[in-house]
């Protein structure tokens, strides 16, 4: 069964850091581009970042550029999101999603930025 | 790089025959193996993607199977329009594709 499982969320103070992970199973992870999408409480979906299958090319939303870093370890079938200089407005459920058409999603992990 | 081999390189068959072509990858490509048909002077045509999924419009006499390193394209009852060259292609290492050397199917 194709699955994505996020972890690493939690409560962090403004200015702090967190590293999210997304463990993939049931498909050939190294084939697909992967993405992070977030959803603030009661709000819509916001694309955060993408990484190509090889890991060599990355894309970021303007709102996180310079603060967040997407990466992947194809040998471990895992996608990462390193989040630095966190702000209150980064509070959201963070989902990882597969491919250009976001055809498979994880269940999400909650990130709360608050003092 | 992933290398692809096919066997046989050519075969002769009659209309109505069951034809099997095999494709082997130098390392596991999971199920990310596609098959193409090419007729002389024409561009290749995608027949089967992801090992066993028939492209829309492709007759059901074509089928694919396998996983890992060993794959098979089967034509259950060869038709006159099926005489062509067939290529396998791995899309595991996308976007850097690798094709097999091809198998030519001609009339016995």
């Amino acid at each position: 069964e194709v699955q994505l499982l996020e972890s690493g969320g939690g409560l962090v103070q403004p200015g702090g850091s967190l590293r999210l992970s997304c463990a993939a199973s049931g498909f050939t992870f190294s084939l697909y581009s992967m993405n992070w999408v977030r959803q603030a409480p009661g709000k819509g979906l916001e694309w955060v970042s993408s990484i190509y299958s090889s890991g060599g090319s990355t894309l970021y939303a303007d709102s996180v550029k310079g603060r967040f870093t997407i990466s992947r370890d194809n040998s471990k079938n895992t996608l990462y999101l390193q989040m630095n200089s966190l702000r209150a407005e980064d509070t959201a459920v963070y989902y990882c999603a597969r491919g250009r058409a976001f055809d498979i999603w994880g269940q999400g992990t909650m990130v709360t930025v608050s003092s | 790089d992933i290398q692809m081999t096919q066997s046989p390189s050519s075969l002769s068959a009659s209309v109505g025959d069951r034809v099997t072509i095999t494709c082997r990858a130098s390392q596991s490509v999971g199920t990310y193996l596609n098959w193409y048909q090419q007729k002389p002077g024409k561009a290749p045509k995608l027949l089967i993607y992801a090992t066993s999924n028939l492209r829309s419009g492709v007759p059901s006499r074509f089928s694919g199977s396998g996983s890992g390193t060993d794959f098979t394209l089967t034509i259950s009852s060869l038709q006159p329009e099926d005489f062509a060259t067939y290529y396998c292609q791995q899309s595991y290492s996308i976007p850097r594709f690798t094709f097999g050397p091809g198998t030519k199917v001609d009339i016995k």
Partner: antibody, heavy 118, light 108 residues
Framework: EVQLLESGGGLVQPGGSLRLSCAAS????????MHWVRQAPGKGLEWVSG????????WYADSVKGRFTISRDNSKNTLYLQMNSLRAEDTAVYYC???????????WGQGTLVTVSS | QYELTQPPSVSVAPGQTARIICGGN??????VHWYHQKAGQAPVLLVY???DRPSGIPERFSGSNSGNTAALTITRVEAGDEADYFC???????????FGGGTKLTVL
């Protein structure tokens, strides 16, 4: 109807240059990775180069790296292949093809012949 | 940056047809993907590249796209279709994914 139409092929001397074009229609060109695949006379298929939807990412076969440049103009729905320092072994029919969401090259052009000879 | 506009809510009776629209400048030249998200769950892809359905998605869900409006049509609406619906495109100028604001579908 999805269509891909290559142009720009011809006869060129070794060391020379050519620019191939591929005009796309019938689909959302800017949503797809696009590729060039070539076929030498009487030989099999060889992947040459690929490009991401925005053109930000490009990939090349080792045999053409440093000599060929792939690009695209999404406003014109056109894919390009700039070929420099051409060699006899680059002689082939060059096809452009669309990558269908990582599941094979589902549409191909009719090809354009490039002949490198003195 | 490219913007997509969706109505905040749509209401429909069971068995009827719901049409959820997504507006964007010349959206007809782009490929639109549609998702639904039920309360407390992750989004699910319903339609990709304007009109194509992933395996497992019922034919009741269909997409269209032309001019400045894309639409998701749900026929024979069921109570279980109640969810938030999001459209999405890739902004080819900057290679950014863009989502619409979402439409809450209420089944009366």
């Amino acid at each position: 109807e999805v269509q891909l139409l290559e142009s720009g092929g011809g006869l060129v001397q070794p060391g020379g240059s050519l620019r191939l074009s591929c005009a796309a229609s019938g689909f959302t060109f800017s949503d797809y990775d696009m590729h060039w695949v070539r076929q030498a006379p009487g030989k099999g298929l060889e992947w040459v180069s690929g490009i991401s939807p925005s053109g930000g990412w490009t990939w090349y076969a080792d045999s053409v790296k440093g000599r060929f440049t792939i690009s695209r103009d999404n406003s014109k729905n056109t894919l390009y292949l700039q070929m420099n320092s051409l060699r006899a072994e680059d002689t082939a029919v060059y096809y452009c093809a669309r990558d269908w969401y990582s599941s094979g090259l589902d549409y191909w052009g009719q090809g354009t012949l490039v002949t490198v000879s003195s | 940056q490219y913007e997509l506009t969706q109505p905040p809510s749509v209401s429909v009776a069971p068995g009827q047809t719901a049409r959820i629209i997504c507006g964007g400048n010349d959206i007809g030249s782009k490929g639109v993907h549609w998702y639904h998200q039920k309360a407390g769950q992750a989004p699910v892809l319903l339609v990709y590249d304007n009109t194509d359905r992933p395996s497992g998605i019922p034919e009741r869900f269909s997409g269209s796209n032309s001019g400045n409006t894309a639409a998701l049509t749900i026929t024979r609406v069921e109570a279980g279709d109640e969810a938030d619906y999001f459209c999405q495109v890739w902004d080819s100028t900057g290679e950014h994914a863009v989502f619409g604001g979402g439409t809450k579908l209420t089944v009366l």
